[in-house]
């Protein structure tokens, strides 16, 4: 129960905490278990003990093994074991499972990735963050304190995130990296009365006679996958298919997108070679789901010709 697994990479700093806790005033002795040899406390040593912490500055593969810590108080002794493994640096980008810290799960709301074990180190902000070995760039990523915040989390944000920081010990700097997986979970979906994003109700669109124009009907229906969610155009209250005018066509199929996690559906009405009679029609954008139907109306008007008179 009082044994803890710790790992690191060669030539990086590794700091291990004794699995047995005690007040900071308690003395903690560290030993190399195989030989029962005491770990020195002098900081000039590459490996030294500092209270509850055992420091490898830097670590070497040969440091791997089990270390014993004994917390000594006036009334009791508590023994713990630190199982330390130091690995060779990987030549490629791939981070093997045995170097990974616990996976964190994220969602649109849940978007912090903490840098593992950083609390043990004397680090200075900002941290560097990498995803699948690529440095993170862009305003969606905010490195703050010991964590990374991702704005507007999307499914393709899933992956392996590595934090890199510098540990400072008596003026000497040592690099530390730590990697954990980030998975994106679907938030619980829900359905609601449709909300039409476009067009605005009773909107008027200016068009030029003889030109082509597109009208987009866009509505959102809730979050996650929807059982029923459809948008369509009507002309003067009739289905497009019932309106025998080949110049006016509704886009085949409907485009479903997820905007901020919302399930939104778009369909485009394409009008070729706009004619005067098209200005007399009423164009209705209809959004329908199990909660009901919402309708927004848009009309076309002629663009004012440019006045060429002097």
């Amino acid at each position: 129960k009082f044994s803890k697994q710790s790992w690191g990479l060669e030539n990086e700093a590794l700091i291990v905490r004794c699995p047995r806790q005690g007040k900071s005033s308690y003395i903690v002795d560290w030993y190399y278990s195989q030989t029962n040899k005491s770990i020195p406390t002098q900081e000039r040593n590459r490996v030294f003990a500092s209270g509850q912490l055992l420091k490898f500055l830097p670590a070497e593969v040969a440091d791997s093994g089990i270390y014993t810590c004994i917390v000594r108080s006036p009334t009791f002794n508590r023994t713990g074991y630190a199982n330390v493994t130091i690995y060779k640096k990987q030549p490629d980008c791939n981070v093997p499972d045995y170097l990974m810290y616990s996976t964190v799960s994220g969602s649109e709301k849940n978007s912090k990735i903490y840098c593992p074990t950083i609390d043990l180190y004397n680090w200075t902000a900002p941290l560097e963050w990498f995803k699948n070995c690529q440095a993170l760039q862009g305003s969606r990523y905010k490195a703050h304190k010991s964590f990374l915040v991702i704005d507007n989390v999307m499914t393709d944000d899933a992956g392996d995130y590595t934090c890199k920081f510098i540990h400072n010990e008596n003026g000497a700097n040592y690099s530390v990296t730590a990697t954990r997986s980030f998975t994106v979970k679907d938030e619980q979906g829900f359905s609601r009365f449709p909300v039409i994003r476009a067009p605005a109700h009773n909107e008027t669109k200016e068009v030029e006679i003889g030109e082509n124009t597109n009208l987009t009907c866009s509505a959102c229906f809730g979050k996650g996958a929807q059982f029923l969610a459809t948008v369509q155009w009507q002309l003067n209250g009739n289905k497009i298919t019932d309106f025998s005018e080949p110049r006016i066509q509704q886009e085949e199929g409907q485009n479903q997108s997820f905007s901020n996690g919302l399930a939104c559906v778009n369909t485009v009405l394409r009008i070729a070679d706009v004619k005067e009679e098209d200005l007399l029609l009423r164009y209705d954008c209809l959004a329908l789901n199990l909660h009901g139907l919402r309708r927004h109306t848009i009309r076309l008007s002629r663009k004012n010709p440019i006045d060429h008179q002097s």
């Epitope: 806790q21 994220g106 978007s111 912090k112 903490y114 609390d119 905010k142 703050h144 010991s146 964590f147």
Partner: antibody, heavy 118, light 111 residues
Framework: QSVEESGGRLVTPGTPLTLTCTVS????????MSWVRQAPGKGLEWIGY?????NTYYASWAKGRFTISKTSTTVDLKITSPTTEDTATYFC???????????????WGPGTLVTVSS | AAVLTQTPSPVSAAVGGTVTISCQSS????????LAWYQQKPGQPPKILIY???TLASGVPSRFEGSGSGTQFTLTISDVQCDDAATYYC???????????FGGGTEVVVK
Amino acid sequence: QSVEESGGRLVTPGTPLTLTCTVSGFSLSSHDMSWVRQAPGKGLEWIGYIWSDDNTYYASWAKGRFTISKTSTTVDLKITSPTTEDTATYFCARDQYRSSGVSDYDIWGPGTLVTVSS
Amino acid sequence: AAVLTQTPSPVSAAVGGTVTISCQSSQSVGNNNDLAWYQQKPGQPPKILIYKASTLASGVPSRFEGSGSGTQFTLTISDVQCDDAATYYCLGGYDDDADNTFGGGTEVVVK
């Protein structure tokens, strides 16, 4: 190093009110700042914070009701449309420098009392 | 939003005795350790005692000890003094963008 709140007063419901937290002895470019409130005889309630890099975050119940902004030496909390439930002492608190978490505030102001009443 | 549930008030303690206050979170705090303990006396702002679940804040006597991880945390005050009479709050930080949450507070009465 200290922080002090000001601007608390009696306001009628719906009248916007801005509280100001003035800091001295440290830089707002190195510390996050939080606003916390406490209704009379009640517990503490976290409202939101503004990070050293100017990003603002709010408790879910506070979104739209409060706005946090800052200058080089002040942090403002705007109560957009106060209701009687917003009657409380409002505290400004400094987040510890270089702490890893977001819950540790080492310097607090004495608080400023806001009373919302018609 | 997360909910932090503290030991119900009031908790009585004798001078020289030990008092334990628990704080349970409905979800894991950030990094499993983003929890702080505060002491508040009437008419005063809160004062930080413990941060990162178990780290003693500067100037705070070692009689105060924080422990726990994930969702379950404890503040232990040993060798209780009259001056420890106050209300104690836990505050958790979470993986959410925001929603830091205070516990409801636990009043400690010293006899």
